[in-house]
Amino acid sequence: NQDLPVIKCVLINHKNNDSSVGKSSSYPMVSESPEDLGCALRPQSAGTVYEAATVEVDVSASITLQVLVDTPGNISCLWVFKHSSLNCQPHFDVQNRGVVSMVILKMTETQAGEYLLFIQSEATNYTIVFTVSIRNTLLFTLRRPYFRKMENQDALVCISESVPEPIVEWVLCDSQGESCKEESPAVVKKEEKVLHELFGTDIRCCARNELGRECTRLFTIDLNQTPQTTLPQLFLKVGEPLWIRCKAVHVNHGFGLTWELENKALEEGSYFEMSTYSTNRTMIRILFAFVSSVARNDTGYYTCSSSKHPSQSALVTIVEKGFINATNSSEDYEIDQYEEFCFSVRFKAYPQIRCTWTFSRKAFPCEQKALDDGYSVSKFCNHKHQPGEYIFHAENGDAQFTKMFTLNIRRKPQVLAEASASQASCSSDGYPLPSWTWKKCSDKSPNCTEDIPEGVWNRKANRKVFGQWVSSSTLNMSEAMKGFLVKCCAYNSLGTSCETILLNSPGPFPFIQDS
């Protein structure tokens, strides 16, 4: 066995949007670090057969199966999948190892199965078996985390009822606003379910599994902060737990906090208080109001009062079903070719939405930002000045929302011409949509100024690029016009563009562009 090659089999997972079938190549994509597939010699098999660990791939995911061979001399190879041979192109890496790759783009059911790689080196022949299966994600769920008080302790437990079981982490920040962004140095993450340190400025709990990541912020009223111009609002669905934290800092311990709902003190057992001294010897008190399962009658103004601070309130609204409130009327925009512009949707929603921006059947990531007035906004700026129809789609499990936008880019027409035996056609995608003129070029009119008044038919049509309009003009050819040059011109407020066509017998026509 000493002349057997040293081989390593790896899986590379790609984050890509391209679609294709298996490619035996090294394909440029953003990749995660390789995972060892532990190729092991298959016992009791005829010939030398290595077996890689089975790989599970999500539908539409892209992967590379790769073999690194430490063997002297050249190697040749062949991939076989479902009795079909696939091209194989080995290359050598910087360590002079032979590298053979199979790229599977946009995994589908038909691409699952056994991939056999036959390798022939100067010393030996051997086979490597890869098994690729589709991950069964039908039962997967990812639910937003919620809070519970830990029995007999002043601590919060974060719970997310998800499949597969998620990793739960607390995300803590003691700064204000922008500095509490996820990757900020001010943010501390604790991968545990129970949190004892409940005095921080910003407290969130996040749960993540293969479906993604969902977070819930601990709703907080800070009596030392200037109140927002609009009353903070908290939405919950019937049956969900309510948690509101009131926080206040004072120079000494001589102050107390209380919660009221619609001017009535909360019942015993639906609040608890904690206090601590901060580094500068000031006293921090927090008072939690909680309801383990809210009903419609828990709706109202929750007011936190202090003997040493102005009181502040929040409006808690209990709804039967989630919602997305936004105006769904379509919007049209007209911009210059180099003008900076972003689409924007302002909405109020509960639970938090998942959203996408789509253009020409391609989905783009969607970011949302919370505003001070309880609304959120999602902007899309990555249109690259491509005209057409853009779609914003949002959903949150209870509600769906779609809004259409049309983007028109102001530009001078560009004319494309084609001709057949009986007609000549010109089209243009300039904006505003151009108007057309046809001129005849002759001995009498060498500059092509003679108008063609008849036989012209203009129309506008939707182009393949979704939502982009194209204007076209067709000239029906009479026998008398054959052999002449004609000129079609498209013009709008930004300029004119023309194309000259020789009207002769059918076949390829020469065009002379002329701006």
Partner: nanobody
Amino acid sequence: EVQLLESGGGLVQPGGSLTLSCAASGRTFSSYALGWFRQAPGKEREFVAAISWSGGNTYYADSVKGRFTISRDNSKNTLYLQMNSLRAEDTAVYYCAAGGSTRVVVTTTPVVKYWGQGTLVTVSS
């Protein structure tokens, strides 16, 4: 870090049944692909069955297909192997195994990150 502890092994007659359990400690049990391997005296350790980290997909060696069933209960942090129609050639030490990836199924020994200490199954009349 995951610790694995097998139980349920013992002596059984040919044609009989046995259920092996593997209790795992560690917070993120459901993040691991799990499997069972076995090693008969004087032989190499071989793959028996594997289950994806979610429990959605299962994989079996040809020699046990239709007789053995692998399952997992993420809420109890436990892996199971239900063995029916046992044969003398199933006699071996059975090991519980966990991989370190959610994409790679533990169907070969090199991808195993954590092993249990093993439980002996003897099939004999």
